[in-house]
């Protein structure tokens, strides 16, 4: 039969630079001598030789002078390859080779890496920062292998996605350089992080700028929003209240107003320089123009999603600056629950009956509560599931497993928490023996 | 370091039209504005423009609004300022100069002369 | 549109000079205010920004003040580089608006 080769299953990788060991061993039959063995290294999708053993001689290598064999471990099966200053043109698999009487091959994947370097950050511009300014942070990472990915987040660590772009080029030597811009709406104040990951040593290099922008010695803007969260029916219209106090002889071209996502910073609608700059969310969304002069800032969303959920954040800069961050509440109200009864006919009492009740399309989670006919609650063996649709709207499912007694009603209520709103169905089962629906 | 070069000197006919370039270098091109300023001799200087390398977003001194048109090249780093319909009170020189509120570099300038 | 008023519209120093250049604005434009300096056949230099705050690079003799609608440029010790026009701009509004420029003379 074939001559058993084995090598590891697992790329090995290594560092550009190092050396790196392609384990590769065979069982020798007793009194075998390495006269007998013939032992080739190659590269596998091109057969390129690369280093050979042969009529009891290390036939040197084939590969830059680069590569060589454990002649004192060959008689013991070890037929690894050593590969010296790796380079990222060595990546890819190798097939060792061996024939004795018999032969036998397998292949070997080499991974080639190097360490990114910490990333160095630049931001432009890099002074008479205000509010409301758009800069451009560059987070440059050098001499790594492979392509990197590279992550930028908030102070708070809230991934940044929006309007990142990254590039990468490799040198001579098939390294890359990793550049990767991050353009951001300046708040108050904000650091920034970058980070460079190197997928195969799962190395992470990261570095952050803090950007304090320039303040007034006037002092800030008091913005103010409502407290409590604003709740808005989905598919219908919200507006997000936010106003300021505008000083005489305050004019629009001096107002920087933006609206972002509170955690995210995504830009939401901005308002510079005496121009409505528009919806950047959508375009759903919109200002008042109108009221903009005597200090209202305040945002209409238009047909309201369960995705829009969550934290504004209203940023108001005139001389100085101010914000403030107002809460999102989605809601929508559950349908009249539908029932369904199981078994529905030739019920006697003592038997187990399920009770299904469902209701449709509401948000948030409902919060589902079963009684009898003297309104005393059943909580015993209810089983109550939620599931959200595409659009985050819930269809809720409440099964309650009851033994029939004479008769009774059963009464389930769904209640929507946001808007208080309570919707309820109720089954009556009487008779005996009875049938159910009752017929007519 | 931070540079940029504008087009050689233009000599026009009035009624015709010009075209300023402005080639930055040494920076990240789509993270300044660019602006236009206009210095006639012997007079104030006065704001043309400016654009947002980054989406093109135009802002025009009113003044300016039908007489100057600015674009951009990203993939060269280019910044444009057409004039058109020239008469001779165009003649001056034009610089590119970007930031926001300040300045900080400006091209050397380039000198149109209109005359028939 | 804020109008810009620089006064004197020249004026003759000699070397060592203490020399002062004022803006006024025609509006409240806090401390949004930028001083350039311009030779001849050369494109203007940014000296102060923020009212009173030294570009990198630019010599401490330089100094701005003021906040409101009222600013001044100080050249603490003339030196013979300093013979040039000077011109405010606000950058509180658009359009942004020069002042017509000091030329600084030897006297």
């Known amino acids: 039969g074939a001559l058993e080769v084995q090598v590891p299953e697992d790329p090995v990788v290594a560092l550009v630079g190092t050396d790196a060991t392609l384990c590769c061993s065979f069982s020798p039959e007793p009194g075998f001598s390495l006269a007998q063995l013939n032992l080739i290294w190659q590269l596998t999708d091109t057969k390129q030789l690369v280093h050979s053993f042969a009529e009891g001689q290390d036939q040197g290598s084939a590969y830059a002078n680069r590569t060589a064999l454990f002649p004192d471990l060959l008689a013991q099966g070890n037929a690894s390859l050593r590969l010296q200053r790796v380079r990222v043109a060595d990546e890819g698999s190798f097939t060792c080779f061996v024939s004795i009487r018999d032969f036998g091959s397998a292949a070997v994947s080499l991974q080639v890496a190097a360490p990114y370097s910490k990333p160095s950050m630049t931001l432009e511009p890099n002074k008479d920062l205000r509010p409301g300014d758009t800069v451009t942070i560059t987070c440059s990472s050098y001499q790594g292998y492979p392509e990197a990915e590279v992550f930028w987040q908030d102070g708070q660590g809230v991934p940044l996605t929006g309007n990142v772009t990254t590039s990468q080029m490799a040198n001579e030597q098939g390294l890359f350089d990793v550049h990767s811009i991050l353009r951001v709406v300046l708040g108050a104040n904000g650091t920034y992080s970058c980070l460079v990951r190197n997928p195969v040593l799962q190395q992470d290099a990261h570095s952050s700028v803090t950007i304090t922008p320039q303040r007034s010695p006037t002092g800030a803007v008091e913005v103010q929003v409502p407290e409590d969260p604003v709740v808005a029916l989905v598919g219908t219209d919200a507006t997000l209240r936010c106003s300021f106090s505008p000083e005489p002889g305050f004019s629009l071209a001096q107002l920087n107003l933006i609206w972002q996502l509170t955690d995210t910073k995504q830009l939401v609608h901005s308002f510079t320089e005496g121009r409505d700059q528009g919806s950047a969310y959508a375009n759903r969304t919109a200002l008042f123009p109108d009221l903009l002069a005597q200090g209202n800032a305040s945002l209409r969303l238009q047909r309201v999603r369960v995705a829009d959920e969550g934290s504004f954040t209203c940023f108001v800069s005139i001389r100085d600056f101010g914000s403030a961050a107002v809460s999102l509440q989605v809601a929508a109200p559950y349908s009249k629950p539908s029932m369904t009864l199981e078994p529905n006919k030739d019920l006697r009492p003592g038997d187990t009956v399920t009770i299904t009740c469902s209701s449709y399309r509401g948000y948030p989670e409902a919060e589902v509560f079963w009684q009898d006919g003297q309104g005393v609650p059943l909580t015993g063996n209810v089983t109550t599931s939620q599931m959200a649709n595409e659009q985050g709207l819930f269809d809720v499912h409440s099964v309650l497993r009851v033994v029939l007694g004479a008769n009774g009603t059963y009464s389930c209520l769904v209640r929507n928490p946001v808007l208080q709103q309570d919707a309820h169905g109720s089954v009556t089962i009487t008779g005996q023996p009875m049938t159910f629906p009752p017929e007519a | 370091e931070v540079q940029l070069v504008q087009s050689g000197a233009e000599v026009k006919k009035p009624g015709s039209s010009v075209k300023v370039s402005c080639k930055a270098s040494?920076?990240?091109?789509?993270?300044?504005?660019m602006n236009w300023v206009k210095q006639r001799p012997g007079q104030c200087l006065e704001w043309i423009g400016r654009?947002?390398?980054?989406?093109?977003?135009?802002r025009y001194n009113q003044n300016f609004r039908d007489k100057a048109r600015l674009t951009v090249d990203k993939s060269s780093s280019t910044a444009y300022m057409e004039l058109s319909s020239l008469r001779s009170e165009d003649t001056a020189v034009y610089y590119c100069?970007?930031?926001?509120?300040?300045?900080?570099?400006w091209g050397q300038g380039t000198t149109v002369t209109v005359s028939s | 549109d804020i109008q810009m008023t620089q006064s004197p519209s020249s004026l003759s120093a000699s070397v060592g000079d203490r020399v002062t250049i004022t803006c006024r604005t025609s509006?409240?434009?806090?401390?949004?205010l930028a001083w350039y300096q311009q030779k001849p056949g050369k494109s203007p230099k940014l000296l102060i920004y923020?009212?009173?705050t030294l570009e990198e690079g630019v010599p401490s003799r330089f100094r701005g003040s003021g906040s409101g609608t009222h600013f001044t440029l100080t050249i603490s010790s003339l030196q013979p580089e300093d013979f040039a026009t000077y011109f405010c701009?606000?950058?509180?509004?658009?359009?942004?608006?020069f002042g017509c420029g000091t030329k600084v003379e030897i006297k």
């Open positions: 040494g920076y990240t091109f789509t993270a300044y504005w």
């Open positions: 100069a970007r930031g926001v509120r300040i300045f900080d570099y």
């Open positions: 509006e409240n434009i806090d401390y949004t």
């Open positions: 701009k606000q950058a509180y509004d658009v359009p942004r608006t």
């Open positions: 923020n009212a009173n």
């Open positions: 654009i947002d390398p980054y989406d093109s977003e135009t």
